[in-house]
Structure formats: C-alpha cells, structure tokens
Amino acid sequence: FERTRSLQDPCSNCPAGTFCDNNRNQICSPCPPNSFSSAGGQRTCDICRQCKGVFRTRKECSSTSNAECDCTPGFHCLGAGCSMCEQDCKQGQELTKKGCKDCCFGTFNDQKRGICRPWTNCSLDGKSVLVNGTKERDVVCGPSPADLSPGASSVTPPAPAREPGHSPQ
C-alpha cells in the first residue's frame, strides 16, 4: 500500500522539515525560515509560534518542530502548549478576580497556584490535631484521643510555627 501510495502521490515522500512544492512540480522543498513541518507529506509548512512579550522562548523553532513558550517570572503557564500566562500568588493565597488574596481561616494553599483548600478534619478519622494548620500548611493529625489517655505513651505536640492567620476576603 505504501508503495502504491507513493507512486500515486509523490508528496508522501517529502520528509518532516520539507513541504511538497506544487509550484516546482511537487519537489520536496525545505521549509522557509520561521516555519516548520513536523510530519512528512505536508503540502505547506506551518508558521513558527513567536514567544513575544511575557511569553519567553523555552525551545527554539526548528524545521521539524514548533517553538515552545513559557511565562516570564511571576506568572505560570496555562492551557495547551502554554497558550496563557496566569499570575503566581504566594503560598497561603489564592488567585481571584481581585488578584491574590489570603486564604480564609480554616483553609490553606501550599503552592504558588491553585485554590485554598480546607484543613483536614482529623476527627473524621478519629484522630486529634497534632500540629495546627496555617494559611500555608494543612493540619497534622496525630493519634486518636483515646491513645493519649493516661497510661498511654503521651506525645507532646510541637508548638505551631505561628498562629493560623485569618484574613477576610
């Protein structure tokens, strides 16, 4: 089948990085500057993506592959192929229409992106809070209260790094 197809369609012989040039009797011509073809048998080359402004070039365009972009510091990529740049926030914050806002009391975010999530409810697993949660960190659950009854080996929880913050939205 491949042999039959190549006899019928000379363009199928054109490798990646070239295109089948109808203006030159279907000769395989190299892709012009700032263009590429990632598969064989192409009748045109695609224009290279330009990483302009806040989009920085992560990988240069070649004759066989498109350029790849990322975002300048302070922003991160979103979407297929880094089609968008979204603002970073600090740990303990989430991004809203009003910009970066502190996590509400009882929630945390340990990353520069994403939303604030509720602290783990230790009591649902029959455990106690060993280390209090903060805006940046989830609570640490310890042994169940029964395990800490007199006679059982006691665990002294370390003091939390700081008081859990409360910032109304």
Partner: nanobody, 123 residues
Amino acid sequence: EVQLVESGGGLVQPGGSLRLSCAASGFTFGSYWLNWVRQAPGKGLEWVANINQDGSENYYVDSVEGRFTISRDNAKNSLYLQMHSLRAEDTAVYYCARGGEDYGNSHFGMDVWGQGTMVTVSS
C-alpha cells in the same frame, strides 16, 4: 491577526497623571475580560487591574486602588488606564493583556499581550 498595542507612556513627575491606551484588533473585543499588568525594572510581572466585558466590573491591586482607573470603550476597541498621584514605584513597562476564554470562572490566564509602554515617574 489578534493584536494589542499600548500607547501613552512617558516621563512624568511624582504626583502627576498619565493616561495609557490599548488598541485591540483581530478579535471580538467586547467578549473578553481585559487586564493591565506591569513590570518594574529588574522585577517580575505584577497584575494591576482588570475589567469585565461590558465595563461593569473592575478590580485593582491594593497599591494602585484609588489612584488608577481602568475603563474601556467597546465601540472603539480600546482599553484605558488613567493614572493619578503617580509615584516612583509606579515606574514600569505597562502591558495590556486579554483574559483567555472563561477568564474569571475556571482560571485567570491571559492569552494575548501587547508589546508594552514604558512609564517613568521621576523628578
């Protein structure tokens, strides 16, 4: 071609005012949130303000609240940033940026950016 082109930057004294403009082309202007984002010399990008499709909703970073006003004219495919009481720390390249599809719901990503206009606040 989808394009955003900023203008209006320049040198202004502390306490002065400036109005930036952003001309859009190649897309349905009134269907998108728009943003101003700035980059001070040697610093990272900082989001400044945004405005929704019909101009009824807008938000600002705390440091410019009450001094800057974002507005848009959908009939002219234009976005504006009126800046008053300018300070040295407002010195930056100011970019106009389009919010991507579904901006404000599932994400706050910006997909089209202008080339920027420089604002220098100095005496």
